[in-house]
């Protein structure tokens, strides 16, 4: 009767850190002679396992107990598998050499075990500084470590699956693998409250995808607007100047008030305003004396935002003519307020 | 240093019992089958009974077949013999063997004598 | 009766080789190892497998097999050496462990 090695599993799946059974049994108990195990096969083909004693196995053992002189069980289970165990599995046996070494007589049709590894919760970074509204700007989201190699990644922003992403796999063993995906996103005044999403799909994680978030609040400036207005003229014959600094974000914020050049008084603002869409307001009143002054003063709200080069606002205060019951000013607003970008 | 140190024995008259222990240590029992074998005096050896590593598999040769049990106890790492209906002819050196991989001997204990007599 | 069948005595001068055969077991289904028994003293497995040596044998024991027959090869014999040899087998249709009669090794001189 021919032997027959018989391995019934064409491929075994487990996950990482599991335990995998590999079975082989023989249909005969002769010819005499070892039953051993290889991964892979031909010229670089690598011993695994030999049911011939004297070697160590750590991870290896036995299923059945080979040492009942009737075992046709071949078996051999693999614990705490990793990547790098995935592989074909080969169940040989051996005859007894006369004077030659053993040779090899008959093999099993082998076992593919695959290693079922998670990808590691994507990690989600943005660009290094703030950009404006209206740049566009790079997410990048990375996963680590997972097999096998099929794996579906996807970006929404605000629920929204994003397109406009270049996604690279990549391996340096061929065991597991790693995943980058970066995606480009324009920006708009409205994203402060938007946050992008990496999903990441794969079989291991049951149809449970694994989220990576990155939010705009963290990547986004908008850059104030400056205003000011002046209330009437008090029976104190002061100037009360008003600087209102509309829809800004993040909150860092300098605000100084210049007499003709020359700074008066420097705000750091504590309190704000917060608006619906995220951004905030911040008002600055400024007190002027108009008998301190005899000629036209021009007053300039300054303002220095996340670091960003200063912004300004003008505000011309004239003067009338000095009577005998005592000087008074008039004001005039200087309409064309420019931005200082330089 | 595989150490195997047999003890039980003495003088039994024919059809009496007889209980063989066999402490082992200096490898790990449990995985190694084991095996009995005995010697007459000014005969050659005999193999007389085997057992699997696990315990569940035993063999004998048709001389001992339905009269000798060999068992173990792994927690113990202890192998036994339990000898009954004994014969003259049982009468001998019983050394208790660990097997190889392929159930040849590597390590044999110092002995134990067995005398049937009445 | 013993099932393997080796010569009951053999001499050999110290320094010379001595070779021991056991035959009578089926080659597709039988290991063989030798045991060498001073008397007195317990049995020391010399080969094992057919021709492994256990590592506290000195090389000079070897063993080799060719068809049903397997020889040990006792190379540079010493004095010490003069023992009762054991074939040993593992019949694997049987499960059984049959053994030779043992040969007497004289050492001569």
């Known amino acids: 009767k021919e032997l027959k090695v018989t391995q019934a599993d064409k491929s075994v799946s487990v996950a990482a850190g599991d335990s995998a059974t590999l079975n082989c049994t023989v249909s005969s108990l002769t010819p005499v002679g070892p039953i051993k195990w290889f991964k892979g096969e031909g010229q670089n083909r690598s011993p695994i396992y030999s049911f011939i004693g004297g070697e160590h196995f750590p991870r290896i053992t036995n299923v059945s107990d080979a040492t009942k002189r009737n075992n046709m069980d071949f078996s051999i289970c693999i614990s705490n598998v990793t990547p790098e165990d995935a592989g074909t599995y080969y169940c040989v046996k051996f005859q007894k050499g006369i004077v030659e070494p053993d040779t090899e007589i008959k093999s099993g049709g082998g076992t593919t075990l695959y290693v079922l590894a998670k990808p590691s919760s994507p990690e989600v970074s943005g660009p290094d500084s703030r950009g404006s509204p209206g740049q566009t700007v790079n997410f990048t989201c990375k996963s680590y470590g997972f097999s096998p190699r099929n794996i579906t990644l996807k970006w929404l922003k605000d629920g929204k699956e994003l397109s406009h992403l270049e996604t690279t796999i990549s391996s340096k063993s061929n065991v597991s693998y790693n995943i980058s995906s970066t995606v480009s996103v324009k920006l708009s005044p409205e994203d402060i409250h938007s946050r992008v999403i990496c999903e990441v799909a794969h079989v291991t994680l049951e149809g449970r995808p694994l989220n990576g978030t990155a939010n705009f609040s963290n990547i986004i400036r908008v850059s104030p607007t400056l205003k000011i207005t002046q209330q009437p003229l008090t029976p104190a014959s002061q100037v009360n100047l008003t600087c209102q600094v509309q829809k800004f974000y993040p909150k860092a914020l300098q605000l100084n008030w210049l007499e003709n050049g020359n700074l008066s008084r420097t705000d750091k603002p504590e309190h704000f305003t917060d608006n619906r869409d995220g951004t905030y307001n911040y008002t600055s009143l400024f007190l002027v004396n108009s008998s301190a002054h005899r000629e036209d003063v021009v007053f300039t709200c300054q303002v220095e935002h996340d670091s960003q080069p200063a912004i300004t606002e003008n505000h011309t205060v004239r003067a009338f003519a000095h009577s005998s019951s005592g000087g008074s000013m008039e004001t005039i607003p200087d309409n064309n307020a420019y931005y200082n970008w330089n | 240093e595989v150490q195997l140190v047999e003890s039980g024995g003495g003088v039994v008259q024919p059809g009496g019992s007889l209980r063989l222990s066999c402490a082992a240590s200096g490898f790990t029992f449990s995985s190694n089958a084991m095996s009995w074998v005995r010697q007459a005096p000014g005969k050659g050896l005999e193999w007389v009974a085997g057992?699997?590593?696990?315990?569940?598999?035993?063999y004998y040769p048709a001389s001992v077949k339905g009269r000798f049990t060999i068992s173990r106890d792994n927690s113990k790492n202890t192998l036994y013999l339990q000898m009954n209906s004994l014969r003259a002819e049982d009468t001998a050196v019983y050394y208790c063997?660990?097997?190889?991989?392929?159930?040849?001997?590597?390590?044999w204990g110092q002995g134990t004598l067995v005398t049937v007599s009445s | 009766s013993y099932e393997l069948t080796q010569p009951p005595s053999v001499s050999v001068s110290p320094g010379q080789t001595a070779r021991i055969t056991c035959s009578g077991g089926s080659y597709s289904s039988y290991y063989y190892a030798w045991y060498q028994q001073k008397p007195g003293q317990a049995p020391v497995t010399l080969i094992y497998?057919?021709?492994k040596r256990p590592s506290n044998i000195p090389e000079r024991f070897s063993g080799s097999s060719s068809g049903t027959t397997v020889t040990l090869t006792i190379s540079g014999v010493q004095a010490e050496d003069e023992a009762d040899y054991y074939c040993g087998g593992y019949d694997q249709s049987s499960y059984t462990n049959p053994f030779g009669g043992g040969t007497k090794l004289t050492v001569l001189g």
């Open positions: 063997a660990r097997e190889t991989w392929n159930h040849l001997f590597d390590y």
């Open positions: 497998s057919d021709d």
């Open positions: 057992i699997s590593a696990g315990g569940s598999d035993t």
